[in-house]
Amino acid sequence: KNLKSPQKVEVDIIDDNFILRWNRSDESVGNVTFSFDYQKTGMDNWIKLSGCQNITSTKCNFSSLKLNVYEEIKLRIRAEKENTSSWYEVDSFTPFRKAQIGPPEVHLEAEDKAIVIHISPGTKDSVMWALDGLSFTYSLVIWKNSSGVEERIENIYSRHKIYKLSPETTYCLKVKAALLTSWKIGVYSPVHCIKTTVENELPPPENIEVSVQNQNYVLKWDYTYANMTFQVQWLHAFLKRNPGNHLYKWKQIPDCENVKTTQCVFPQNVFQKGIYLLRVQASDGNNTSFWSEEIKFDTEIQAFLLPPVFNIRSLSDSFHIYIGAPKQSGNTPVIQDYPLIYEIIFWENTSNAERKIIEKKTDVTVPNLKPLTVYCVKARAHTMDEKLNKSSVFSDAVCEKTKPGNTSK
């Protein structure tokens, strides 16, 4: 009886694992083995595919074959018993194009209200992704084990920290890789779960802000308790993108080590031009807080994010405020080519109860004012990128008197 060729050959490539699967064409014939040959582009001869000779099952692995993953190859298969079937040719393919990104390796660390996720490619020193190793980005899905409500986080790098979690709570997550340059989305990792710790006695510092005064940077933060010491560290932001790096060498800012106030001042020349991450930690001598949320600090933006200038048109029950570009020395306006949001603080001159307005527009109405009353206004600009978290210092306060009644038209 003539042996039939095997059919429906599928090539599965995940990272550096090359798997072939096929269907037997005749289930009734026993003791059949299968063998593959391969052919590279531009070659006439067929070569035996090592790892896929005389196979009794319908699956084989040819990962040991050292192929150029960018070069097209062709495969053929036949069945063998006493005689052999005819060859069945598989459509030619390029391994790199066909390859899927495998599940990444995930390592979790827990704090009381945060989880640190370290992600690395599932195949170390992969041949398939050798030229793309630095281009991996990751996305994850996280949920509370008790609720199952999922949150997706896109475009993260090999280390990511998720904040604002609950203490003593189990969170589960899965991660997948992507190579956006090649339009490839990977396979999810297995689910990893970790329980956050008991609540720490000392909370981390909050609301870290950097501003410029003279030739110095002023770093300020909020803290719940008094009589604490603080330390501030910095890291080059690009290091977070380095996939092989499991050790982030955070560095002390010398003038911000063991400070006893909720701010520190250090010279601008401490940092060369670039983007940095900053974090603050509190200690009371016995206990240490976890680190604060990391803020992104761009020296370029920081240096040029100046307080806005504004004009006030006074009415009886409101002020119209017109915000213009800040002036640098020489009275020339500064072009700020990134979107800003404005924080306007106003108060009655005789009181210190402040009110606040946050506005994206450059013309702002301050409503509900009393006639013939002096109000003072100051403003500052913030970048709209949450991660960048840049703020100018406040402008000088400008005080104006509202008009008498019935002038609001």
Epitope: L108, T197, N200, E201, L247, K249, N287, T288
Partner: antibody, heavy 118, light 107 residues
Framework: QVQLVQSGAEVKKPGASVKLSCKGS????????IHWVKQAPGQGLEWIGR????????KYAPKFQGRATITADTSISTAYLELSRLRSDDTVVYYC???????????WGQGTLVTVSS | DIQMTQSPSSLSTSVGDRVTITCKTS??????VAWYQQKPGKAPKPLIY???YRYSGVPSRFSGSGSGTDFTLTISSVQPEDFATYYC?????????FGPGTKLDIK
Amino acid sequence: QVQLVQSGAEVKKPGASVKLSCKGSGFNIKDYYIHWVKQAPGQGLEWIGRIDPEDAETKYAPKFQGRATITADTSISTAYLELSRLRSDDTVVYYCGRYHGYWALDYWGQGTLVTVSS
Amino acid sequence: DIQMTQSPSSLSTSVGDRVTITCKTSQNVGTNVAWYQQKPGKAPKPLIYSTSYRYSGVPSRFSGSGSGTDFTLTISSVQPEDFATYYCHQYFSYPYTFGPGTKLDIK
């Protein structure tokens, strides 16, 4: 493969100084921290300090501040621990270890015995 | 400094027994705890990092758990080569510290 090889045993007199070395191979010393740990005979492990060989930044346990000096020479992948004003209770084994972030001290040297005796 | 206590300080056990060693820290250290095994005259051998992850080549009978201030090392079935001293280590904040050790010997 990754290895940390420490210098040989030393015998010193009280008041003298000693400088121990720890040579790394199979990895780039600049990408890690090198830590030093002491262990008295029959006792536990005690952390002395660490160095970032890339920029020579150091941290010390308060107890060793001023008496221990950790340095590194990246050109020969070697870290050093110098101990001054040796006392008889400095008769201990000193270990170096490679620190790798969340992996902690993932490789250790074989240890160097320092004997302080008059 | 973060203080670390280990219990028990010594433990006599038999091959095949399940053993649990506990380690307490004086403050919350997250999951920044490692465990090392040391035999006389030898350097410490890394077993567990980040509370619960086994180093490559460490047998699966060793496991770690815990977080915050309470950590445990478990040997599910003690083997003859496991008789040694075990140390926990916190690397959350400087100065790094070690537990005083737990000596595991044959009953």
